[in-house]
């Protein structure tokens, strides 16, 4: 590449690799690399690959174009995921089983483990496995608000399909919101969209882990797979600007 | 200010005008200033200057952050806008009022007229002035489909105000989908958002134009503020890429 | 655009997105990050020359804006447009942690 | 954000917004433009040293990432972040028409 | 300001047994692994173990296994060294260290001399 | 168990003098290197963590550099507080392993 003088493209590749060397410490805040050597031997951990997984890819329902993003979220988030509450709980039994609805409740404990300050929470998604659909279906995400009612959050329209695919929505404001409150259980509904003069709302979409009946060996990947909250969040020690360069717990 | 050497902000500053100067007839496809010689006399008519000030303000539901242009979005669009057929007119005798949803239909040889190819189009925005409203409201809206299906578009939510604020929906699609089909009248729908087990489902918010019984001068007033299409298309003489610097119109 | 797609398979000079992958232990020396084992950075590269749009010119530079100098800027720079995360598997001492990195992963540029 | 907010206000050196009001009459000499009469057009200016991450700096350095090379470039470049559009009212022959033209006014800059 | 002090000098018998403690103050006992490093009469430094305050958690050197027990105590933010069946050998200056992650130790206690002879 | 050399073990040098002390690793230890300073009777005290990063508070002509197996501490003007044992360790594999020190004297 030449413009009046030539580009020594290595040394611009030096530069870069040199520049994103300090970009990850600084995204992590550290100061130097943590150290390895305790690190236990073997592969990585099921739970921690299937985390970083999650991460990894893109879903329907996601945008794939980065906002300019704020100062804020220049440093790097913490992933975690806290599955939904197994259906036999107890909590489920309040809600009566409808033909339009499926109900996905949280433990907040999990979530104040994991994120122990609602500000310091960058993204909430709820995560859903859909399996395979026959027919379009237009769905719409609710939160449980105070006893018996429920606040619209978003919706989506879900073409046909032959395979599984993962689903997200963004909860984030949601989430904040359980954080600041003394709750012990909160959840989501998952709605077909009711029009107000049509009569067919069932719900037709099947989402992994709410059917029954399954062999003990499927039942057990199914509730792996069962809906979650992808939380991605600033550390505490991160975000509490230590000035020293401390790799904290 | 400075880095090795000082910079010339007067430079800089004149740099800066001059590409912008190329920049304004660039997005235009100008190769020079149109000619002023037969402008009329006096002020810009009401209707360019309604038409300017719609383009100008920021209203309800748009967002203020660009995205990054598509290489298309580079070049100017014309604005142009086209107001929803009377409610007077026959087609909405076809509609039965209902509590729950008001009708809006445009004239699609107007949006021909201004738009001629529908790959000219670059964005559409249906804008509503929402008066006074006492309760939050969550609307919807759909698009007419087939003889009495509808289609959902969007929704939003409604936060209680005590001043007239224009609303504005991003319809792009389905313009684009009018322009290249044959029919004459096309419409959307505007209704309370229903779920599956509420009652309550009246639209409570008041659009501007469909409120009956006012006094003659207050009903023009009334008619000009009704909802109307926003267009933003690229001039078709633009859009033919012609070598020529050529005023066309 | 000047995207993956095109810039890597043309010989732009001009601004561009450039191909480049960094294997962590190999170009940075670490050992520290379990996954992913590198990343396409990708950069941004090339001239955006700025176009002096002084009336001798018109015809023959304003077709030239679009691309090279669509901002109207001073000095227009090569510089990245779209941008993506990349999610990392570390460890502090023997805890794993997972963590999203914004905006490390160039997928096109544009003359800004 | 290197905004308006923040730039206007302050004296700083490195990479900001820096104010520019554009009249079509006076400064570009133009008098085909009908509406508006100008318009707060800004531009970025300001260096964005490029930060060379060697071990013995790490510490000193790490912080100033955010601010001047978040983008980990070669050669970080103070450009435009924020950008609204301007709409314009002009006529051609006796037609008076009124166009949008995209990202015309800076309203925050980054290194980038 | 983070600290470290230790207990005082101490004088043993072979085959006896001796614990010292390490009182932490100026951060969160909890957050950081709590090391025990020795050095014999102008030799140089032998890291002997560590203790996760945490959870508890304690890994030796191959050397000590068997012969130290490390404990803490999290409400007075103490930790703990005990090495029993002393030998002569053992007469050293003893240190605890804080850990941090990356690989190094940041903060020392003052030192404490064993002495061991008969 | 990494085996970690260093030289000189002791060293006489005057204020104001460059002073240079060395440490090699019996195996690659990633720059996972760090320089302690001992005085008698005092507590120990980090200079230098990951070859080349200054713990904060330490006097910027103490610094540090290598790769792989070879590392040095540099000291470019010796001052008067600045005569005491020099150690380093490395932090890259358990156990975790020390020089045999430097001891720095007044000429």
């Known amino acids: 590449l030449s413009t009046c003088k030539t580009i020594d493209m290595e040394l611009v590749k030096r530069k870069r690799i040199e520049a994103i060397r300090g970009q990850i410490l600084s995204k992590l805040r550290l100061a130097s690399p943590p150290s390895q050597g305790e690190v236990p031997p073997g592969p990585l951990p099921e739970a921690v690959l299937a985390l970083y997984n999650s991460t990894r890819d893109r879903v329907a329902g996601e945008s794939a174009e980065p906002e300019p993003e704020p100062e804020a979220d220049y440093y790097a988030k913490e992933v975690t995921r806290v599955l939904m509450v197994e259906t036999h709980n107890e909590i489920y039994d309040k809600f009566k089983q409808s033909t339009h609805s499926i109900y996905m409740f949280f433990n907040t404990s999990e979530l104040r483990e994991a994120v122990p300050e609602p500000v310091l929470l960058s993204r909430a998604e709820l995560r859903l496995l859909r399996l395979k659909l026959k027919v379009e279906q237009h769905v719409e995400l609710y939160q449980k608000y105070s006893n018996n009612s429920w606040r619209y959050l978003s919706n989506r329209l879900l073409a046909p399909s032959d395979s599984p695919e993962w689903l997200s929505f963004d909860v984030t404001g949601v989430v904040r919101q359980w954080l600041s409150r003394g709750g012990e259980i909160e959840g989501f509904r998952l709605s077909a969209h009711c029009s107000c003069d049509s009569r067919d709302n069932t719900l037709q979409v099947d989402i992994n882990g709410f059917t029954t009946g399954r062999r003990g060996d499927l039942a057990t990947i199914h509730g792996m797979n069962r809906p979650f909250l992808l939380l991605m969040a600033t550390p505490l020690e991160r975000a509490q600007h230590l000035q020293s360069s401390r790799h904290r717990r | 200010l400075s880095t090795c050497k000082t910079i010339d902000m007067e430079l800089v500053k004149r740099k800066r005008i001059e590409a912008i100067r190329g920049q304004i007839l660039s997005k235009l496809r100008l190769a020079s200033p149109p000619s002023q010689g037969e402008v009329p006399p006096g002020p810009l008519p009401e209707a360019v200057l309604a038409l300017y000030n719609s383009t100008r303000d920021r209203v309800a539901g748009e967002s203020a952050e660009p995205e990054p242009e598509p290489e298309a979005d580079y070049y100017a669009k014309e604005v142009t806008r086209v107001l929803m057929v009377e409610t007077h007119n026959e087609i909405y005798d076809k509609f039965k009022q209902s509590t729950h949803s008001i009708y809006m239909f445009f004239n699609t040889s107007e949006l021909r007229e201004a738009v001629p190819e529908p790959v000219l189009l670059s964005r559409a925005e249906l804008r509503l002035l929402r008066l006074k409203l006492k309760v939050e409201q969550h609307v919807e809206l759909y698009q007419k489909y087939s003889n009495n299906s509808w289609r959902y578009l969007s929704n939003r939510l409604l936060a209680p105000s005590d001043s007239p604020e224009w609303l504005s929906f991003d319809v792009t699609g389905v313009v684009r989908q009018w322009l290249s089909r044959g029919g004459e009248i096309e419409g959307f729908r505007l209704s309370a958002h229903c779920s599956c087990d509420s009652r309550d489902n009246t639209l409570q918010v008041d659009i501007n134009g469909f409120t009956t019984g006012r006094r003659g001068d207050l009903a023009t007033i009334h008619g000009m503020n009704r909802p109307f299409l926003l267009l933003m298309a690229t001039p078709l003489e633009r859009a033919q890429h012609l070598q020529s610097s050529r005023h066309r119109r | 655009a000047l995207d993956t797609n095109y810039c890597f398979s043309s010989t732009e000079k001009n601004c561009c997105v450039r191909q480049l992958y960094i294997d962590f232990r190999k170009d940075l020396g670490w050992k520290w990050i379990h996954e992913p084992k590198g990343y396409h950075a990708n950069f941004c590269l090339g001239p955006c020359p700025y176009i002096w749009s002084l009336d001798t010119q018109y015809s023959k530079v304003l077709a030239l804006y679009n691309q090279h100098n669509p901002g109207a800027s001073a000095a227009p720079c090569c510089v990245p447009q779209a941008l993506e995360p990349l999610p990392i598997v570390y460890y502090v001492g023997r805890k794993p942690k997972v963590e999203q990195l914004s905006n490390m992963i160039v997928r096109s540029c544009k003359c800004s | 954000a290197l905004d308006t907010n923040y730039c206007f206000s302050s004296t700083e050196k490195n990479c900001c917004v820096r104010q520019l009001y554009i009249d079509f009459r006076k400064d570009l000499g133009w008098k085909w433009i009908h509406e508006p009469k100008g318009y707060h057009a800004n531009f970025c200016l300001g260096p964005c040293p490029y930060i060379w991450s060697l071990d013995t700096q790490y510490s000193k350095v790490l912080a100033l990432y955010n601010q001047h090379n978040p983008g980990a470039s070669a050669a970080p470049c103070c450009v435009p972040q924020a950008l609204e559009p301007l709409p314009i009212v002009y006529y051609v022959g006796r037609k008076p028409k009124v166009e949008q033209l995209s990202n015309m006014i800076v309203r925050s800059c980054k290194c980038s | 300001e983070v600290q470290l002090v230790q207990s005082g000098a101490e004088v043993k018998k072979p085959g006896a047994s001796v614990k010292v403690s390490c009182k932490a103050s100026g951060y969160t006992f909890t957050s950081y692994d709590m090391h025990w490093v020795r050095q014999a009469p102008g030799q140089g430094l032998e890291w002997m173990g560590r203790i996760d305050p945490q959870s508890g958690g304690i890994r030796y050197a191959q050397k000590f296994q068997g012969r130290a027990t490390l404990t803490v105590d999290t409400s007075t933010s103490t930790a703990y060294m005990e090495l029993s069946r002393l030998r002569s050998d053992d007469t050293a200056v003893y240190y605890c260290?804080?850990?941090?992650?990356?690989?190094?130790?940041?903060?020392w206690g003052q030192g404490t001399l064993v002495t061991v002879s008969s | 168990d990494i085996q970690m050399t260093q030289s000189p073990s002791s060293l006489s040098a005057s204020v104001g003098d460059r002073v240079t002390i060395t440490c090699r690793a019996s195996?690659?230890?990633?720059?996972?290197l760090n320089w302690y300073q001992q005085k008698p009777g005092k507590a120990v005290k980090l200079l230098i963590y990951y070859t080349s990063v200054l713990e904060t508070g330490v006097p910027s002509r103490f610094s540090g550099s290598g790769s792989g197996t070879d590392y040095t501490l540099t000291i470019s003007s010796l001052q008067p507080e600045d005569f005491a044992t020099y150690f380093c360790?490395?932090?890259?594999?358990?156990?975790?392993?020390f020089g045999q020190g430097t001891k720095l004297e007044i000429k």
């Open positions: 360790q490395q932090g890259d594999t358990l156990p975790w392993t």
């Open positions: 195996q690659d230890i990633y720059n996972y």
């Open positions: 260290a804080r850990w941090d992650y990356g690989g190094y130790f940041d903060v």
